[in-house]
């Protein structure tokens, strides 16, 4: 637990360089996020596709669309889990990281340094060991998120099922109903490629204990889109005086040392015969 | 035919309890949230908060964080509304609905016949 | 939360009359919703999404709006529409009902 309260941002004297000092695991070992890049990563053909099971949301169902300060959460039923890992790990909610319309490169893990330009994090907890996310966050093997990056491309309506509901949760503390939707939507293409390492929170209190599955290809949202995620939310309650915009809610990459990153997938990028006769 | 049906309301003591039951039939009952939604005399309707049955998450509304607990049976398709610490205030008739979508929001197009709660020393 | 004031909160009108109830929301909503409730009952879905009627109800009823102000309309009032409307929107936690405008008979 924090040793004074839960005050903490992304910029200024609460900003990620003071976390430590209320939350002692953020300078700890196992943080998060980290950059991806070749001379960590490491071949593992153990690594076999995830299952998302009960991740078709029925529009019949209402889920509580959150501001809470930091990012824009989306409440998740316990009922949706992944399959493939040791044990069952339940969904609690999604969230997003991004950058700000003058430098829109907000994503939290980098591949080769390069950031993208947003980051939803799906964030699930080891439902065979404990009954809910909060006991889960701080327990060895607790919990595991599924990283998707996000780069400015194409529209995506399957991301606009969240983003259409920002209006309605523009300050802290505000929530809106969202129909159910089919949350594999979210995921890019080929899931079966991805990059795993265990690794913390990335936000207060960085707990050091989440299996991370960072997917190796993007997904695409448009720059309409970026934009209004970067332009609708503020950090501050409705009634603040000095109100605070939502942008650069991402951490840092943290040291990665002595340790591995292992994909299930071989490095090669196979190209693709487009536009070769 | 789709219905809901309520019970358990009645005379309760100030600072007493009350758990309602909601039977629902007619319909996939793990498909649709359960909503108790109330009814103060003379007032308009007020929402306390649902359940999904599937799973048996919950969602209040923060006036009633602490003092209403929703719960379910998927054995007897029933949705059960405890509340404690009761007051006056909470004399109300107690309705369960069912949202249903229609393609861009919802709406309660199914309501039980409401159980009157009466909290009177 | 969102408040919902409806206007008026109660009016007389004879059969035949136009009658039209306003709600208007303290935030702006995606949609209203619309629910009809006769004493002693329980309500009953009359117009979803701002102008949808629910089924079984007659096309002499309407609703329209947008943003925060939304009404609901009565072209020609029937014996059977004397009752009590509330508005309702599921845009934002914890969803509100108006307080309702009760139709009497003049």
């Known amino acids: 637990a924090p040793v004074n309260g839960s005050k903490w941002t992304y910029f200024g004297p609460d900003g990620e360089n003071s976390w430590s000092k209320k939350y002692p695991s953020c300078g700890g070992l196992l943080q998060s996020p980290i950059d991806l890049h070749s001379d960590i990563l490491q071949y593992d053909a153990s690594l076999t596709p995830l299952e998302f099971q009960g991740y078709n949301l029925s529009a019949n169902k209402q889920f509580l669309l959150t501001n809470n300060g930091h990012s824009v959460k989306l409440n998740l039923p316990s009922d949706m889990h992944i399959q493939g890992l040791q044990s069952r790990y339940s969904a609690t909610q999604l969230h997003l990281h991004w950058g700000n319309p003058n430098d829109p490169h907000g994503s939290e893990h980098t591949v080769s340094g390069q950031h993208f330009a947003a980051e939803l994090h799906i964030v699930h907890y080891n439902s065979d060991l404990y009954p809910d996310a909060s006991t889960a966050s701080n327990k060895s093997e607790g919990l595991a998120v599924l990283a998707v990056l996000i780069e400015m491309g194409s529209f995506n309506p399957s991301y606009d099922k969240i983003f259409s509901h920002l209006q309605h949760v523009k300050y802290k503390g505000q929530e809106a109903f969202v129909p159910g939707f089919n949350i594999e939507e979210l995921l890019p293409e080929r899931t079966a490629e991805y990059y795993r390492y265990r690794g913390s929170l990335t936000t207060p209190p960085c707990n050091p204990t989440v299996l991370w599955t960072v997917f190796r290809n993007p997904v695409q949202i448009s720059q309409e889109q970026l934009l209004a995620l970067e332009t609708a939310l503020y950090c501050t309650h409705m009634d603040d005086p000095s109100p605070r915009e939502m942008i650069n809610n991402f951490r840092q990459v943290q040291k990665f040392d002595e340790r591995l990153v292992y994909t299930s997938f071989s490095q090669v990028q196979v190209c693709t015969a487009a536009g070769l006769s | 035919e789709v219905q809901l049906v309520e019970s358990g309301g009645g005379l309760v003591q100030p600072g007493g309890s009350l758990r309602l039951s909601c039977a629902a039939s007619?319909?996939?009952?793990?498909?649709?949230?359960i909503y108790w939604v109330r009814q103060a005399p003379g007032k308009g309707l007020e929402w306390v908060g649902y359940?999904?049955?599937?799973?048996?998450?919950?969602t209040y509304n923060q006036k009633f964080k602490g003092r209403a607990t929703i719960s379910v049976d998927k054995s007897k398709n029933t949705a059960y509304l405890q509340m404690n610490s009761l007051r006056a205030e909470d004399t109300a008739v107690y309705y369960c609905?069912?949202?249903?979508?229609?393609?861009?929001?919802?709406?309660?197009?199914?309501w039980g016949q409401g159980t009157l709660v009466t909290v009177s020393s | 939360d969102i408040q919902m004031t409806q206007s008026p909160s109660s009016l007389s009108a004879s059969v035949g009359d136009r009658v039209t109830i306003t709600c208007r929301a303290s935030?702006?909503?995606?949609?209203m919703h619309w629910y009809q409730q006769k004493p002693g009952k329980a309500p009953k879905p009359w117009i979803y999404a701002t102008s949808s009627l629910a089924p079984g109800v007659p096309s002499r009823f309407s609703g329209s709006g947008s943003g925060t102000d939304f009404t609901l309309t009565i072209s020609s009032l029937q014996p059977e529409d004397f009752a009590t409307y509330y508005c309702?929107?599921?845009?934002?936690?914890?969803?509100?009902f108006g307080q309702g405008t009760k139709v009497e008979i003049k």
């Open positions: 359940i999904d049955p599937a799973n048996g998450d919950t």
């Open positions: 007619g319909y996939s009952y793990t498909d649709y949230n």
């Open positions: 609905s069912r949202p249903i979508y229609y393609g861009a929001y919802w709406y309660f197009d199914v």
């Open positions: 935030s702006p909503v995606t949609y």
């Open positions: 309702q929107q599921w845009s934002s936690n914890p969803l509100t």
